[in-house]
């Protein structure tokens, strides 16, 4: 897994008029890290883990950079010619990565109303766009605007590549990103469902990274997919994740059922409490 820094900015227009403010989210190694609200950008650490390690300087710098990027994205949205009535969004996602072999990647992707229409490899400056004619029209429009803007401001995309990597390296150096594994706490509960049936729920919490297998087994054999309900894997605000799986079983057969958990190469089974 490479280390990664991901910036996600969204700006909106209503009836062709670009709205003030923007939404920005920053993820570090896939974890929510910073957030700016729509009206006033104040970079907020997502979770105590980020706040503890990085000082105010970081939030000030990120606030300044994200505010500038939000302003640029609003200008870009204003130049999209085919805006129709109603609400429209322009989203820019910028990602940079450092791989185990020390090679780097960085790219930016533009979405209009949720549809990808333009990407750029920031390291090489190569542009790519989907084949659809709408996407290509949008892409040429935005690309030409960005190109003119870059010529005026003398800022080129390799600067974005360098800046993103510089930030990522700074965070890695600060120790905020630890290549850690935090095992989940697993808790099994039961509740009455209907006469003769109970619902058993298996919850896993406080784990990192987010990849996990959680499922119910009967006599050691996994239940079919359609007999189980899964919750999404969600951040719990502490840099770790939580999820759950539930199924309905006959009362009196609890001892035949176990919750199976697999995470980062470790696995365990958990019985239903009697």
């Amino acid at each position: 897994e490479p280390h990664s820094l991901r910036y996600n900015l969204t700006v909106l227009s209503w009836d062709g008029s670009v709205q003030s403010g923007f939404l920005a989210e920053v993820h570090l190694d896939g974890q929510p890290f910073l957030r700016c609200d729509r009206q006033k950008c104040r970079a907020k650490p997502q979770g105590q883990w980020a706040e503890d390690v990085l000082g105010n300087k970081t939030w000030d710098r990120e606030t300044r950079d994200l505010t500038g990027n939000g302003k640029d994205l609003r200008m870009t949205l204003a130049h999209i010619k085919d805006q129709k009535e109603g609400l429209h969004s322009l989203q820019e996602i910028r990602v940079c990565e450092i791989h185990e072999d020390n090679s780097t990647r960085s790219s930016q992707h533009f979405y209009y109303d949720g549809e990808l229409f333009l990407s750029q490899n920031l390291e090489t400056e190569e542009w790519t766009m989907p084949q659809s004619s709408r996407a290509q029209t949008l892409a040429m429009n935005v690309r030409n605007f960005l190109k003119e803007d870059a010529m005026k401001t003398k800022t080129h995309y390799h600067a974005m590549h360098a800046d993103c990597l510089q930030e990522l390296r700074r965070y890695l150096k600060s120790g905020v990103v630890l290549r850690r594994t935090v095992p989940p706490m697993v808790n099994v509960t039961r509740s009455e469902a209907s006469e003769g049936n109970i619902t058993v729920t298996c919850r896993a919490s406080g784990f990192y990274p987010w990849n996990i297998t959680l499922s119910w087994r009967q006599d050691g054999v996994s239940l079919s997919h359609d007999t189980q309900q899964w919750g999404d894997v969600l951040p719990d605000g502490n840099g770790t994740y939580q999820t759950w799986v539930a199924t309905r079983i006959c009362q009196g057969e609890e001892q035949r059922f176990t919750c199976y958990m697999e995470h980062s190469g470790n696995h365990s089974t958990h019985p239903v409490p009697s």
């Epitope: 791989h99 090679s103 990647r105 390291e123 090489t124 400056e125 190569e126 190109k147 390799h158």
Partner: antibody
Framework: QVQLQESGPGLVKPSETLSLTCTVS?????????WNWIRQPPGKGLEWMGF???????KYNPSLKSRVTISRDTSENQFSLKLSSVTAADTAVYYC????????WGQGTTVTVSS | EIVLTQSPATLSLSPGERATLSCSAT???????FHWYQQKPGQAPRLLIY???NLASGIPARFSGSGSGTSYTLTISSLEPEDFAVYYC?????????FGQGTKLEIK
């Protein structure tokens, strides 16, 4: 029809600087793409040397970085390669090529480094 | 840098046979930045397949490409006499751009 044509001396003395130019016709080098230099020593594989992009950014292969310079002349729609302090190991066919997936190539020019 | 390793180094087949050439990378490559070239003696290389699976202009449909991550494949479904050449893979994900060492496809 996009065409690329390399030109420059076929013989360079050791320790001197190799200079080649690629003239592009049918497409403006400031419109798009990277404009690359790639070389191939006799009987060997291909080695990417570097590029100048449509925006004027240059990128080089770190194995050659201290010796290689790529520049462009937008008025002539040309880009050039300079490789300093050459040795016999720099004897190769030198190609210029367009793009990132190199869709157009020059026919190549053979450069021999020998005294 | 990302090192590309092609296998086999030499492939000996007869016209009409199917050829499968492999290219393996030391680090993950985005499929949109992966390409294949064909080179015949005394000629410049020619773009064969771009972005992993797209045929370049004028390339016959017997050529196809696939792959993702660190593993890519070039397939020639039924070899024609003019297909015997050297084939190179190339990545444009990250600087420096790199090529594989080549696979020589020769007549058996």
């Amino acid at each position: 029809q996009v065409q690329l044509q390399e030109s420059g001396p076929g013989l360079v003395k050791p320790s001197e600087t190799l200079s080649l130019t690629c003239t592009v016709s049918g497409y403006s080098i400031t419109s798009d793409y990277a404009w690359n230099w790639i070389r191939q020593p006799p009987g060997k594989g291909l080695e990417w040397m570097g590029f100048v992009s449509y925006s004027g950014t240059t990128k080089y292969n770190p194995s050659l970085k201290s010796r290689v310079t790529i520049s462009r002349d937008t008025s002539e729609n040309q880009f050039s390669l300079k490789l300093s302090s050459v040795t016999a190991a720099d004897t190769a066919v030198y190609y210029c090529a367009r793009g990132y997936g190199f869709d157009y190539w020059g026919q190549g020019t053979t450069v021999t480094v020998s005294s | 840098e990302i090192v590309l390793t092609q296998s086999p180094a030499t492939l000996s087949l007869s016209p009409g046979e199917r050829a499968t050439l492999s290219c393996s990378a030391t680090s993950s490559i985005s499929s949109i930045y992966f390409h294949w070239y064909q080179q015949k003696p005394g000629q410049a290389p020619r773009l064969l397949i771009y972005r992993t699976s797209n045929l370049a202009s004028g390339i016959p449909a017997r050529f196809s490409g696939s792959g993702s991550g660190t593993s890519y494949t070039l397939t020639i479904s039924s070899l024609e006499p003019e297909d015997f050449a050297v084939y190179y893979c190339q990545q444009g994900t990250t600087i420096p751009f790199t090529f594989g060492q080549g696979t020589k496809l020769e007549i058996k």
